[in-house]
């Protein structure tokens, strides 16, 4: 926070994890820094060690409990501090009053599987991971399919405006290798963002029957 621009961004996975990134132009790579979490209405405090992810950027995960435990609610405020060691003392570099359900980023969907595949279509299902029961059905998904000779960035996005943990891909080419990814986002939260993309699921359409299109 001394020289250059500084940025401290955190997201809550809706259950028991707050992931933070702190970036600081001109900061020393070998400085020892931590994120401290101090909730306003909970008995616990939590700390994580910031580790370098790039030249001027550090990240860490505040593990608040077991993965599926509901550690925070929409009324909680958690004061988050970046503290860096300077000699024998700790110095506060960045601070924010973090509202967890205004800053959501869920875990990537998991357990992707092909339910049924044909020559021109494929039905795929997935599961959401560590998502709060508070959302009920208030989630949306984006999906994309990687076709041969294209990149993920070129893949058109398919939007599912409801909590639907499956999709039927149509107009596929027979006997062709594809990959599929999906991501999830709660409808709640001013600064909420998409989860990371799921691990790609590779599948192959069935070959066309001989003598047919």
């Amino acid at each position: 926070a001394v020289n250059g621009t500084s940025r401290f961004t955190c997201f809550y996975n809706s259950r028991a994890n707050i992931s933070c990134v702190w970036s600081q132009d001109g900061a020393l790579q070998d400085t020892s820094c931590q994120v401290h979490a101090w909730p306003d209405r909970r008995r616990w405090n939590q700390t994580c060690e910031l580790l370098p992810v790039s030249q001027a950027s550090w990240a860490c995960n505040l593990i608040l409990g077991t993965p599926d435990s509901q550690k925070l609610t929409a009324v909680d405020i958690v004061t988050l501090r970046v503290m860096c060691r300077e000699g024998v003392r700790w110095r506060m570099m960045a601070i924010q009053d973090f509202k967890p359900f205004e800053n959501l980023r869920l875990m990537a969907p998991i357990s992707l599987q092909v339910v049924h595949v044909e020559t021109h279509r494929c039905n795929i299902s997935w599961k959401i991971s560590q998502a709060s029961h508070y959302f009920e059905r208030h989630l949306e998904f984006e999906a994309r399919t990687l076709s041969p000779g294209h990149t993920w960035e070129e893949a058109p996005l398919m939007t599912l405006k409801q909590k639907q943990e499956w999709i039927c891909l149509e107009t596929l080419t027979p006997d062709t290798q594809y990959e599929f990814q999906v991501r999830v986002k709660p409808l709640q939260g001013e600064f909420t963002t998409w989860s990371p993309w799921s691990q790609p699921l590779a599948f192959r359409t069935k070959p066309a029957a001989l003598g047919k299109d």
């Epitope: 004061t79 960045a94 601070i95």
Partner: nanobody
Framework: QLQLVESGGGLVQTGTSLRLSCAAS????????MGWFRQFPGKEREFVAA????????VYVDSVKGRFTISRDNAKSTVYLQMNSLKPEDTAVYYC???????????????????WGQGTQVTVSS
């Protein structure tokens, strides 16, 4: 480095007003939030009030809400504490403080502030 110098303290009667000033010099462009703490004899310093870099956010300890007002003039690199309806229990040494850390909270602690003035005595007699 950054220096903070308080002024405006003194001896006043219960129910009257006083305005503390704190002038910053040195690397003032580094300053983000500024605030006031106070220390009673034999006690730890306690938070009184803080103000964000642009003056848009302020926070006060419950015991001074509605009586004290914090403000700042960035052009003069000065922060003020207007103290009205003073009480004998407001008697303390008042310290100006500043941080170059980014961000804002409503829950400031002593350790959050890296820069401190020498303090100015405020005595409220009954």
């Amino acid at each position: 480095q950054l220096q903070l110098v308080e002024s405006g303290g003194g001896l006043v009667q219960t129910g009257t007003s006083l305005r503390l000033s704190c002038a910053a010099s040195g690397h003032t462009s580094r300053i983000n939030a500024m605030g006031w703490f106070r220390q009673f004899p034999g006690k730890e310093r306690e938070f009184v009030a803080a103000i964000s870099r642009n003056g848009g956010s302020t926070v006060y300890v419950d015991s001074v809400k509605g009586r004290f007002t914090i403000s700042r003039d960035n052009a003069k690199s000065t922060v003020y504490l207007q103290m009205n309806s003073l009480k004998p229990e407001d008697t303390a040494v008042y310290y100006c403080t500043a941080t170059d850390a980014v961000g804002w909270t409503t829950r400031w602690m002593t350790a959050d502030f890296g820069f401190w003035g020498q303090g100015t005595q405020v005595t409220v007699s009954s």
